[in-house]
Amino acid sequence: EEELQVIQPDKSISVAAGESATLHCTVTSLIPVGPIQWFRGAGPGRELIYNQKEGHFPRVTTVSDLTKRNNMDFSIRISNITPADAGTYYCVKFRKGSPDHVEFKSGAGTELSVRAKPSAPVVSGPAARATPQHTVSFTCESHGFSPRDITLKWFKNGNELSDFQTNVDPAGDSVSYSIHSTAKVVLTREDVHSQVICEVAHVTLQGDPLRGTANLSETIRVPPTLEVTQQPVRAENQVNVTCQVRKFYPQRLQLTWLENGNVSRTETASTLTENKDGTYNWMSWLLVNVSAHRDDVKLTCQVEHDGQPAVSKSHDLKVSAHPKEQGSNTAPGPALASAAPLGGSG
């Protein structure tokens, strides 16, 4: 009679984490008498996975009824596969012996690889806001995937970015892997509504990549432009001066009027006008009683935006001349040292 062969038909199988893996094994003869055992690995360090005769293997079930007299199928099913189950599994026939069974023949082995999905990518931006023309870094992380091969792309408003660096860890063997990527993005004044997207593609996702997003509204600070203008006279001794605060983001802004360097009024921006690009405009006005001044008046509009150092614009109001509309001076004036820092609300 032909000598028994142990046949493991599958050289390799791939199973998704959480599913069951079926490891096929058949023998070609009922002789010699003796049990089948399954091992992960070979040599002296191999691990027993299933023993037909003894032991408790809660995750392992046999595919066919091993108690049947003529059974030659010793396939097993391992439930709830995790990446830690990866390895080469050997079906080994033992010959009945005393006191111990004697290894008779091994199958060629079945390599089990485990597919595990990457976690949803998490995109994080810089801790502090940055202004247009500055380059900021975004990071994207995803974990727990297997096998190691993975593709990561960056987009800004649908346009693919090229300035990024990606690492997959660990470099060596692991049951699962992590990816970490850092992208550099140059901010523009129009980026309040922009999004940065990190896209991860992996064999387990069947062509439907995972995406993580970050809104540049969390990252960008667009500083305001200021314009101070004198309006036509409202009454004989009163002049209306307005400070137009344009194109700023985020909303948090505090404005202080100074007359000849002395604080006249402080107000926090409210009832803002939103522009199409997501920035805001705001206007503040000051009614100046010209008759209360003997000399010319220097009016300064000082704006503290989002906790940044104050910016200001000044306007010279001529008192000596008969009250009439004055031209505006839009040359930037220095932030006044006499003005105490003011915490805005927004």
Partner: antibody, heavy 122, light 112 residues
């Protein structure tokens, strides 16, 4: 193809600990045994021990009390530590890969590092 | 431990001629699965050992077919059908059946 590179100090003082690392490049740690073998000057080969990819270790009984082999799969490295060294531990130390795919035995030490000379001297 | 004994200690050879090295083990290396767990290695001068034969008779990848291994149980032989100049060095047998793995003392092959 797979390459192994030993690294560590070439000189160790008597009674101190010898520490060597072997870096595996161009291949996987999985499914292999990772071995340390030494060769004293002008003498034959002596097996120190090995570690399987699943972390199981096997040591030469003559050295077992002084030897620890560990595996860092994430770095594709394995290491040898030998305590209380004496001049008799002076040797070329090789790291090597051992195959296993047929039952309880081993199927050849098929990849070797180039060896690193360790001298034990004060 | 399994003791491995090699002979001869030294083997002067003539290029183109055959050569033979013997290795004996203190216990059988034939496992119940039918494999004999014995390896042969060649260590050329100044180099690391190189695997020639595993499981007694299987040639390792890239090894020229002039090298062959035979034997079973406790007696094993490495044959070189036609020695070449590059074959000089020390040949070692090693049992791979059980730990500790043990080597023979080596056979130094040199050109006459």
């Amino acid at each position: 193809q797979v390459q192994l590179q030993e690294s560590g100090p070439g000189l160790v003082r008597p009674s101190e600990t010898l520490s060597l690392t072997c870096t595996v490049s161009g291949g996987s740690i999985r499914n292999y045994y990772w071995s340390w073998i030494r060769q004293p000057p002008g003498k034959g080969l002596e097996w120190i021990g090995f570690i399987y990819y699943n972390g199981r270790t096997f040591y030469n009984p003559s050295l077992k009390s002084r030897v620890t082999i560990s595996l860092d799969k994430s770095k594709n490295q394995f290491s040898l530590k030998m305590t209380s060294v004496t001049a008799a531990d002076t040797a070329v130390y090789y790291c090597a890969r051992v195959r296993a795919y047929s039952g309880i035995g081993l199927d050849g030490t098929d990849v070797w590092g180039q060896g690193t000379t360790v001298t034990v001297s004060s | 431990d399994i003791v491995m004994t090699q002979s001869p200690l030294s083997l002067p050879v003539t290029p183109g001629e055959p050569a033979s090295i013997s290795c004996k083990s203190s216990q059988s290396l034939l496992y119940s699965n039918g494999y004999a767990y014995l390896d042969w290695y060649l260590q050329r001068p100044g180099q690391s050992p190189q695997l020639l034969i595993y499981q007694g008779s299987n040639r390792a990848s890239g090894v020229p077919d002039r090298f062959s291994g035979s034997g079973s149980g406790t007696d094993f032989t490495l044959k070189i059908s036609r020695v070449e100049a590059e074959d000089v060095g020390v040949f070692y047998c090693m049992q791979a059946l059980q730990t500790p793995l043990t080597f023979g003392g080596g056979t130094k092959v040199e050109i006459k």
